[in-house]
């Protein structure tokens, strides 16, 4: 039976050249994580794998760094990274995990209606 | 001034698919993500999902997922959603809101109704 | 799903008169850089939702500062000062901070 649960940094408002980290977290089980695929829709970002470590797709090295941890750094957003983010938790012997996490990248013109938010 | 224009009423048959529309207006079409909202029997609230115009990405409640799809026309600066496989429980009055998750869902449109019957 | 519960779900109220709705979730809607998205909305019969407050304690453009929100982590208020009859209707906060976004049940606000 699948007890766990994922916690993730929360959906993500962030101004366009910015930077952020998108993180999952899994717990509430034993047991334990094979690798984690991050994607984004239907491209596969980067993978953290137990035994090889990161891999991090050839067309998103430029702006995607490995970590903290088993979270993501996404850097020099454009609009045009604007969506959903998944963190995919494969673990034995329970199976996979699955979070998800909305990322709104904004030109800097409309961040500033909201500027009392702390933007990444 | 903002303003979000949504096709009328329809009456359709359970099975049948429909689409609706949502015209935006007085601002950056492809600067803002659209969300759409069903309220049903007077009251609830609920999110469907929402489009990004820029890139055309989505993120869908996962309970409307195979029930609703978005889309976008960047050249009429124009919202769809399309509702699938009808049922008398899609019976709702549908909403186009502009949204950012800093400001919430700041503009609506009108509102469309779609009644389910044979 | 954060499930968001607000109260109450029925509000008599007379002009004048001074009220709070309360919004709370599931789960904390501060992200991981402190931001909370949750907002509020009027809903009046025949017109569509309006936004009144946002992030929180942000009054939207045009909103009479009788509006007031405050809150954080999982629990929030939005507070009426002086009750207008334009002010009756059914009010709706929202959480954007987890998928899928999430309103509240809603509170009828209504004349005793």
């Known amino acids: 039976m699948m007890t766990g649960t994922i916690e993730t940094t929360g959906n993500i408002s962030a101004e366009k050249g910015g930077s952020i980290i998108l993180q999952c977290h899994l717990s509430s089980t034993t047991a334990q994580v094979t690798q984690v695929n991050w994607e984004q829709q239907d491209q596969l970002l980067a993978i953290c794998n137990a035994d090889l470590g990161w891999h991090i797709s050839p067309s998103f090295k430029d702006r995607v760094a490995p970590g903290p941890g088993l979270g993501l750094t996404l850097q020099s957003l454009t609009v045009n990274d604007t969506g959903e983010y998944f963190c995919i938790y494969h673990t034995y012997p329970d199976g996979t995990y699955t979070g998800r996490i909305f990322l709104e990248v904004l030109e800097s013109s409309v961040a500033e209606h909201g500027a009392r938010f702390q933007i990444p | 001034e903002v303003q979000l224009q949504q096709s009328g009423p329809e009456l359709v048959k359970p099975g049948a698919s429909m689409k609706i529309s949502c015209k935006a207006s007085g601002f950056s079409f492809t600067g803002y993500t659209m969300n759409w909202v069903k309220q049903s029997h007077g009251k609830n609230l609920e999110w469907i999902g929402l489009i990004n115009p820029y890139n055309g990405a989505t993120s869908y409640n996962q309970k409307f997922k195979g029930k609703a799809t978005l889309t976008v026309d960047k050249s009429s600066s124009t919202a769809y959603m399309e509702l699938l496989s009808l049922t008398s429980e899609d019976s709702a009055v549908y909403y186009c809101a502009r949204g950012t998750l800093i400001t919430g869902f700041a503009y609506w449109g009108q509102g469309t109704l779609v009644t389910v019957s044979a | 799903d954060v499930v968001v519960t607000q109260t109450p779900l029925s509000l008599p109220v007379s002009f004048g008169d001074q009220v709070s709705i309360s919004c709370r979730s599931s789960?904390?809607?501060?992200?991981?850089?402190?931001?909370?998205?949750l907002s509020w909305y009027l809903h009046k019969p025949g017109q569509s939702p309006q936004l009144l407050i946002y992030?929180?304690?942000n009054r939207f453009s045009g909103v009479p500062d009788r509006f007031s929100g405050s809150g954080s982590g999982t629990d929030f208020t939005l507070k009426i000062s002086t009750i207008k009859p334009e002010d009756l209707g059914l009010y709706y906060c929202l959480q954007g901070t987890h998928l899928p976004l999430t309103f509240g049940a809603g509170t009828k606000l209504e004349l005793k």
């Open positions: 992030g929180i304690s």
């Open positions: 789960q904390s809607l501060a992200n991981s850089y402190g931001n909370t998205y």
